[in-house]
């Protein structure tokens, strides 16, 4: 089903407007901001979600060492340009004609330039490292229980096949979830790791994107797992291109 037929809502994206005007009176939902039709049986792309977020009223808003090429989303929110499939366009510009290139998760991967800046292709983010710190607990979580629960969560809630959860690392109180998905691995219908990571990030922050479902209640063997800090690193198939000035700052 593309949306909940009974009351015509989008289970996977509350930032939509839905009406029974699809073929045969079926419920059809469109993302706020872009007006693009979305498939409510799966996750909405991060680009459309960011666009919807920017259009909404403002009040609605062994551990791995990240590689030297890992990107962190320091720029925060912006109103992105999305292609007809809902993916980020490789080049993004703001209202003052400042432009930059982004990767497939919408994170800037070049210095900012002007309208002459060229971004030849949308570079795929193939490796995402989600770094979490959990609140103090009576004891450490069992690593294999934690691994199993996080894999289950990504499969059942975010529809991400466990083969894209490369590893779960744990050194109390730090949890690292490695998502990996090469272009060659991603089949039609597979959820993108960038979209799954974004939904997870919003869930962790208590800003669930799901319609009518409770927020994320993460438990390991019945013990609540409460996250107090999240940091996400993005690794692209082609390393980013920043000037030395930025790298030494």
């Amino acid at each position: 089903h593309t949306a909940a037929q009974d009351n015509c809502t989008c289970p996977t994206n509350k930032m939509t407007v839905c009406s029974p005007d699809g073929p045969g009176g079926r419920c059809q939902c469109r993302a706020l901001g872009s007006g693009m039709a979305v498939d409510c049986s799966t996750l909405t792309s991060k680009c459309l979600l960011l666009k919807a977020r920017m259009s909404a009223p403002k009040n609605a808003r062994t551990l791995v060492r990240p590689s030297e090429h890992a990107l962190v989303d320091n720029d925060g929110l912006y109103d992105p340009d999305c292609d007809p499939e809902g993916r980020f366009k490789a080049r993004q510009c703001n209202q003052t004609s400042v432009c930059w290139c982004v990767n497939s998760v919408g994170v800037r991967r070049t210095d900012k330039g002007d309208l002459s800046l060229r971004c030849d292709e949308l570079v795929r983010t193939h490796h995402i490292l989600i770094d979490l710190r959990h609140r103090p607990t009576a004891g450490a979580f069992n690593h294999s229980d934690l691994d199993a629960e996080l894999r289950r969560l990504f499969r059942e809630r975010y529809r991400l096949h466990p083969k894209f959860v490369a590893a779960v690392h744990y050194e109390q109180p730090t949890i690292q979830i490695e998502l990996r998905q090469n272009t060659s691995q991603k089949a039609a219908g597979d959820v993108d790791i960038g979209d799954a990571a974004y939904y997870f990030e919003r869930d962790i922050k208590g800003e669930s994107l799901f319609q009518g479902r409770g927020g994320l209640d993460l438990r390991v063997r019945g013990e609540p797992l409460q996250v107090e800090r999240t940091l996400i690193y993005y690794l692209d198939e082609i390393p980013p291109k920043f000037s030395m000035k930025r790298l030494t700052a």
Partner: antibody, heavy 119, light 111 residues
Amino acid sequence: QVQLVQSGAEVKKPGSSVKVSCKASGYTFTDYSINWVRQAPGQGLEWMGVISTYYGDASYNQKFKGRVTITADESTSTAYMELSSLRSEDTAVYYCARYGDGYNQFDYWGQGTLVTVSS
Amino acid sequence: DIQMTQSPSSLSASVGDRVTITCRVSESVDSYGNNFMHWYQQKPGKAPKLLIYRASNLESGVPSRFSGSGSGTDFTFTISSLQPEDIATYYCQQSYEDPYTFGGGTKLEIK
């Protein structure tokens, strides 16, 4: 403890449909997807499809596409598998099986439902 | 679809013997070191029971005489010391991509 209890044996005529139920207990129903697997007499195991109990939609083995419908009722913690246009080759034991935590293994199985297709 | 070739299709062994079953897959089921290969035991008239998941992980409550190994396309299931209650048919299964597929089964009998 986790249990999957299936409906009883059925005898059906060729061309008709059968609907088998699988009632889950001992865990939160929407936390785990449910698969359906069948086994013809003296034969091996064949995966038919899986339903996301969280989202309520299913994906199917192409071999059965168009003939099999998997549904779930969250209010009763029950999954259903309906197979239409039955033929004698569909005579088999049908199992429901829950996904395990991490790697899409099937960690709990129903006891099986024998469906006999005979004229 | 991923094809599973399990061998032997049947075997006869004595109590206390070491028993080995192999499963060869038509394409790799390894994703970043995680092998989506599992082993089940099925006794006559009963539902299958999960013994090994992710190629080598023993399911909770399963005796330690059962083990699994392998990666990529070649996998092995071993019973270190056969017991009378191990008489059953054993199946390998991949869950790397759907349709999930099973090996043809190995029927184990006591000599």
